[in-house]
């Protein structure tokens, strides 16, 4: 069964800056990736970025830079201040869609006791939905 992993890291140099990395562990080709915060996209979460493998990338504040790392993984840098700034317990979710085969979504947040700039290697996160 395909899985999605999510890794959240706070940058040591800028404490209001977060890096979210997500990956798809499966054999299907990805048609769209949606990154949201505050919960799953479409279930109370707010969209931060949408990435299409061929047509480009769309992103919204406080997302600063979204990009493909590989054909099956993406990264997103968030930077905010005030109301739009993420906090340490913010939940970030990534949904990988392979239309029409299915979509897989997982969420993650900053590890409770992690030092800024340090994080464990990405591990598969629980799948919240597989359509």
């Amino acid at each position: 069964t395909p899985e999605v992993w999510v890794q959240v890291r706070m940058e040591a140099t800028e404490l209001s800056s977060f890096t979210i990395r997500c990956g798809f562990l499966g054999s299907g080709s990805i048609s769209l990736v949606t990154v949201s915060w505050g919960g799953p996209n479409g279930a109370g979460g707010t969209t931060l970025a949408v990435l299409h493998p061929e047509r480009g990338i769309r992103q919204w504040a406080p997302a600063r830079q979204a990009r493909w790392e590989t054909q099956s993984s993406i990264s997103l840098i968030l930077e905010g201040s005030g109301a739009s700034s993420p906090c340490a317990n913010t939940t970030f979710c990534c949904k990988f869609a392979s239309f029409p085969e299915g979509s897989w979504e997982a969420c993650g947040s900053l590890p409770p006791s992690s030092d800024p700039g340090l994080s464990a290697p990405p591990t598969p996160a629980p799948i919240l939905r597989a359509d």
Partner: nanobody, 120 residues
Framework: EVQLVESGGGLVQPGGSLRLSCAAS????????MGWFRQAPGKGLEGVAT???????KYADSVKGRFTISRDNAKNSLYLQMNSLRAEDTAVYYC??????????????WGQGTQVTVSS
């Protein structure tokens, strides 16, 4: 959980009509477009008709003048009126919600699909 449920598919004779419906529930859609896509046996996925939040509508050349897409925001529903159906319209039709890239709607969520078969 996101749910898009299609209905209205079936078997129809060439020249006949069908109306597909798609009911969206369980979520507040955050994308900017919705549409109908289809996949014929042994063929790739094809965008049939899409509509964005501004009401802009696009049709595949193969269905222009025969198919009409519409939506009812109050009912959270999307429709596809298909007239003058041809054998080549036979496919599984998917209702999808997504994001616009380069003027094209890219699905982020979709239903299970409904089979449309045009045959005498």
């Amino acid at each position: 959980e996101v749910q898009l449920v299609e209905s209205g598919g079936g078997l129809v004779q060439p020249g006949g009509s069908l109306r597909l419906s798609c009911a969206a529930s369980g979520f507040t859609f955050s994308g900017d477009c919705m549409g109908w896509f289809r996949q014929a046996p042994g063929k790739g996925l094809e965008g049939v008709a899409t509509i964005d939040n501004a009401g802009r509508i696009k049709y595949a050349d193969s269905v222009k003048g025969r198919f009409t897409i519409s939506r009812d925001n109050a009912k959270n529903s999307l429709y596809l009126q298909m007239n003058s159906l041809r054998a080549e319209d036979t496919a599984v039709y998917y209702c999808a919600a997504g994001w616009t890239f380069g003027g094209q709607c890219s699905p982020a969520d979709w239903g299970q699909g409904t089979q449309v078969t045009v045959s005498s």
